[in-house]
């Protein structure tokens, strides 16, 4: 153990000094470019939404140069206050003059998770046994990336294993919320969410499998899409859980505004993805789905009964409800079925049916970041343990014992029945939508942002993300409003309804929180990403139309 | 909520007219009123709308030249056009919480 905790802390080291000189690095090109170009009026340029931008670098009003390094330079500054970047992808530089000019992405700087491998970089994950192990190739999507002229420039932070909604790993520290200092910028894209959020990256990747895009999109007031989870390439990712395919792992794009997810999109939707990864169906972007301006038909719930949703999050609900009426759509009250199921047995169960052990692996040695929680020691108790645990807390705290029975390992049958019942649920809520002839569903998203090591403790509030990940549909979220003096007022009754210490959590970890942005949720049936697109465009149109790009 | 439409009618391009649609109910006050328009041979679609707490929203056509309004003492919205065109004609309706009025027609000519 002592010699595994010595290579941990050479591990730290070894990480945090690698981030340092990449750092210097970015800075130091920046400022070059700026002695350099004077005249450039840098915060015009970073003021561009993604649209608008992509066009003045196919008319060569504007040089990728210019907007590498003024992205570089924003980047780097925003950085200091958040702790977002993890290493700077150096030979974007190079990247840069090899960048096809017909690309729909020519010269666009896209940040990246870590987890999106990237040729002679590390994606640690936080944790130290991925420490000095760097990638041979880059992963589909980025490969795919540089082919539409786009050119990753960062890598961003994650909690230690992904396996949160925090983002905090022993490696490189804690990343902060770019709004409040004081909380989390969600996770596990979390220093996506802070880098796009602070307007560092104009364009970004994460990946999902309980709300890891969405999360962080929410907290940190952008826009976020997770799609159904094979209509962009996995290749490549690095995790640290292969095979599990219950719940299924998303990657997808983060942005400013609706319209730079669809431009991402539309870019990776391309022949070249469908040639280097043919397991992915190739569906290329439906342009007349997305532009598409008939009335919708959506579905609603202001709570899923799981967690009571905070007064910020039913009235950025219901604002948009009555919005999206106004606008000439209907509503119909809708609520997937049998939730608790759904969050309690599937997909816990489904995420750890071999009992966290392939998980723990991870940890070997290791240190264990406090924002996981009790994670790993929950997963580290024998089985028989785990299940008396779950039969005497049950009275007291029904859903932490539903999670804790959910959390042991099963047989190979057990996991077939399992993932057989979650088909079956898939079905039902499809019946259901059906039945009430919906195009889409709008729904609240966890907001405002949790302070630094809640999320840890209020495991339940992923209901709201984690359904659609257990269904598979493409859900996105969308910034609509901001905590108001009232909402925070109100926040005092929160009791939540179960009254346990999830709950509890919650209620303290989103004090303080007046200015934050508050997101809904919008989602889809399953490969129907353009509509959900379309459907997060006309929320974003009716409630922060200053956010159109003309 | 019942809602009536008045103030359409033949005005030049260029010109100006106010709808006013007056509500009767006490739910107006406590819910979005929302303008549609609906042209020759056309969709109906949103024109304006203003919420509860006064936040505006402008389709792309009519922006920088319409203003939607209203006074809650009075149960009445408001929407006064200016520098019409004649891709403006078309019947005007209002909308509060589902329900809405019987149109009033606007018809902008050269």
């Known amino acids: 153990r002592w010699s595994g905790r010595r290579t941990a802390r050479g591990a730290v080291v070894r990480a945090r000094q690698r981030q340092r000189a990449g750092l210097e690095n970015m800075d130091r090109a920046a400022q070059r470019f700026r002695l350099q170009n004077p005249d450039l009026d840098s915060e015009a340029l970073l003021a561009l939404p993604l649209p608008q931008l992509v066009q003045k670098l196919h008319s060569r009003e504007l040089a990728p140069e210019a907007v590498l390094f003024t992205y570089v330079g924003k980047a780097w500054e925003v950085n200091k206050g958040t702790n977002c970047v993890t290493s700077y992808l150096a030979d974007c530089e190079t990247q840069l003059s090899q960048a096809p000019r017909q690309g729909l992405l020519y010269g666009v700087p896209v940040s990246l998770k870590e987890c999106f491998t990237y040729k002679g970089q590390d994606s640690t994950l936080g944790l130290s046994l991925n420490e000095g192990v760097p990638a041979e190739c880059d992963s589909v999507v980025v490969h795919v990336l540089k082919l539409q002229g786009a050119v990753p420039f960062v890598h961003t932070n994650v909690p230690q294993s992904m396996f949160s909604y925090d983002c905090s790993n022993p490696l490189f520290g804690q990343t902060v919320n770019p709004w409040k200092s004081s909380k989390s910028p969600g996770g596990s894209s979390g220093g996506e969410g802070a880098l796009i959020g602070s307007g560092g990256s104009p364009l970004g990747l994460g990946t999902d499998i309980g709300g890891s895009i969405r999360f962080p999109s929410s907290f940190c007031g952008i826009c976020g899409l997770k799609p159904t989870g094979n209509r962009l390439s996995k290749s490549g990712l690095k995790g640290c859980v292969y095979g599990q395919e219950a719940v299924r792992l998303s990657v997808g794009p983060m942005a400013r505004d609706v319209e730079s997810l669809a431009l991402c999109l539309r870019a990776l939707l391309c022949e070249d993805m469908f040639r280097l990864d043919p397991t992915v169906p190739p569906l290329p972007f439906r342009e007349e789905v997305y532009t598409s301006s008939q009335p919708l038909r959506v579905g609603y719930y202001e709570t899923d009964n799981y967690t009571m949703p905070s007064p910020a999050m039913r009235r950025a609900v219901l604002e948009t409800k009555q919005s999206l009426e106004a606008a000439g759509h209907t509503l119909v009250p809708f609520l997937p079925s049998n939730i608790p199921h759904a969050l309690e047995t599937l997909s816990t169960g489904g995420l750890f049916s071999d009992g966290g052990h392939t998980f723990l692996q991870n940890f070997k040695g290791d240190f264990v970041d406090p924002c996981l929680g009790d994670l790993v020691s929950i997963l580290k108790l024998p089985q028989w343990l785990k299940g008396l645990l779950a039969f005497l807390v049950k009275p007291l705290l029904p859903r932490l014992s539903a999670f804790l029975s959910n959390m042991k390992s099963r047989s190979a049958g057990k996991l077939w029945e399992l993932q057989h019942e979650i088909e079956v649920y898939r079905k039902t809520v499809i019946a259901q939508w059906r039945a009430l002839d919906l195009d889409v569903v709008l729904t609240p998203m966890l907001a405002p942002a949790l302070d630094l090591n809640a999320p840890g403790r209020a495991t339940g509030a992923v209901s709201y993300t984690m359904l659609y990940n257990c269904l598979d549909f493409p859900a996105g979220v969308v910034p609509v409003t901001t905590v108001t003096a009232e909402d925070e007022a109100q926040m005092e009754h929160y009791r939540g309804y179960f009254g346990d210490i999830w709950d509890k959590m919650l209620q303290k970890g989103m004090k303080k929180s007046v200015g934050l942005p508050v997101a809904v949720q919008c989602v889809a049936l399953p490969w129907q990403e353009e509509l959900c697109l379309r459907f997060m465009r006309e929320v974003e149109r009716l409630m922060t139309p200053e956010k159109q790009s003309s | 909520v019942q809602l009536v439409e008045s103030g359409g009618g033949l005005v030049q391009a260029g010109g100006s007219l106010r709808l006013s649609c007056a509500a009767s109910?006490?739910?107006?006050?406590?819910?979005?009123m929302a303008w549609h328009r609906q042209g020759p041979g056309k969709q109906r679609g949103l024109v304006a709308f203003?919420?509860?707490?006064?936040?505006?929203v402008y389709t792309d056509s009519v922006k920088g030249r319409f203003i939607i309004s209203r006074d809650n003492a009075k149960n009445t919205g408001f929407l006064q056009m200016n520098s019409l065109k004649p891709e403006d004609t078309a019947v005007y309706y209002c909308?509060?919480?589902?329900?809405w009025g019987q149109g009033t027609q606007v018809t902008v000519h050269h």
């Open positions: 909308y509060v919480a589902g329900n």
């Open positions: 109910g006490r739910t107006f006050s406590d819910n979005t």
């Open positions: 203003i919420t509860t707490g006064g936040r505006t």
